[in-house]
């Protein structure tokens, strides 16, 4: 079969970590240094891709499969495959076009990457404020006001139940 | 340019073992990827097994589990160790590295 099959097309068989050449009449030849095929069948090896300048390689380059590449420390990963990196803030801080900037007012991140998000709209869910928010938190939220007023049973209600589709904050 | 010799073909029955040697002289310093092809007459030129640029060794399906390609820098020589050999393994077979090929040496197995 194998050989049937090399009469129709012989760059079939080629394996990956190897390339069918066009220069030697279509025989399978492995890939050249720093270069990689992945898959069989190739007609060309890829060049390796190489981690410079703010990346780093977290994984070598193999004839059969590509270098990876991350960050180095103060920059994360954007992009399919680490395709560029982004500049660390502080939690608390946004990434802006002038750099990193603290977080506006009723605004948190609690991470080092991404933009700032408002804080959660306690009374939206019909509850109050238990903890205020800060640059770096969400506020958190606590019963309903109409919980805490004088005469309130201390056992909590079950909550209503809510519409298929929502869920809770 | 390298110059590659192989030798250890023979005649041997199915399921006996060869050991080919390939020895490399000259500018064996640009060697980084080595080979083993095989061919029959009339027969395109096929891979078998083969060192690659990050020394790590490959085989083609059909010498999976059977042959076993190995390198020794010391003695500038590649080896290719042919086990459980079958009829059909019946070939001549060539090193290769680069444009250097060596001039064959002849694999029969019959019973």
């Known amino acids: 079969f194998e050989r049937t099959r090399s009469l129709q097309d012989p760059c079939s068989n080629c394996p990956a970590g190897t390339f069918c050449d066009n220069n030697r009449n279509q025989i399978c030849s492995p890939c050249p240094p720093n270069s990689f095929s992945s898959a069989g069948g190739q007609r060309t090896c890829d060049i390796c891709r190489q981690c410079k300048g703010v990346f780093r390689t977290r994984k070598e380059c193999s004839s059969t499969s590509n270098a990876e590449c991350d960050c180095t420390p103060g920059f994360h990963c954007l992009g399919a495959g680490c395709s560029m990196c982004e500049q660390d803030c502080k939690q608390g801080q946004e990434l802006t076009k002038k750099g990193c900037k603290d977080c506006c007012f009723g605004t948190f991140n609690d991470q080092k990457r991404g933009i700032c998000r408002p804080w959660t709209n306690c009374s939206l869910d019909g509850k109050s404020v238990l903890v205020n928010g800060t640059k770096e938190r969400d506020v958190v939220c606590g019963p309903s006001p109409a919980d805490l007023s004088p005469g309130a049973s201390s056992v909590t209600p079950p909550a209503p139940a809510r519409e298929p589709g929502h869920s809770p904050q | 340019a390298v110059q590659l010799v192989e030798s250890g073909g023979g005649l041997v029955q199915p399921g006996g073992s060869l050991r080919l040697s390939c020895a490399a002289s000259g500018n064996i310093s640009s060697i980084r990827v080595i080979s083993w092809y095989r061919q029959g007459p009339g027969k395109q030129r096929e891979l078998v097994a083969w060192?690659?640029?990050?020394?790590?060794?490959h085989y083609v399906d059909s010498a999976k589990g059977r042959f076993t390609i190995s390198r020794d820098n010391t003695k500038k020589t590649t080896y290719l160790q042919m086990n459980s050999l079958k009829l059909e393994d019946t070939d001549v077979y060539y090193c290769n590295s680069g444009d250097s090929w060596g001039q064959g040496t002849q694999v029969t197995v019959s019973s």
């Open positions: 060192i690659a640029w990050d020394n790590i060794a």
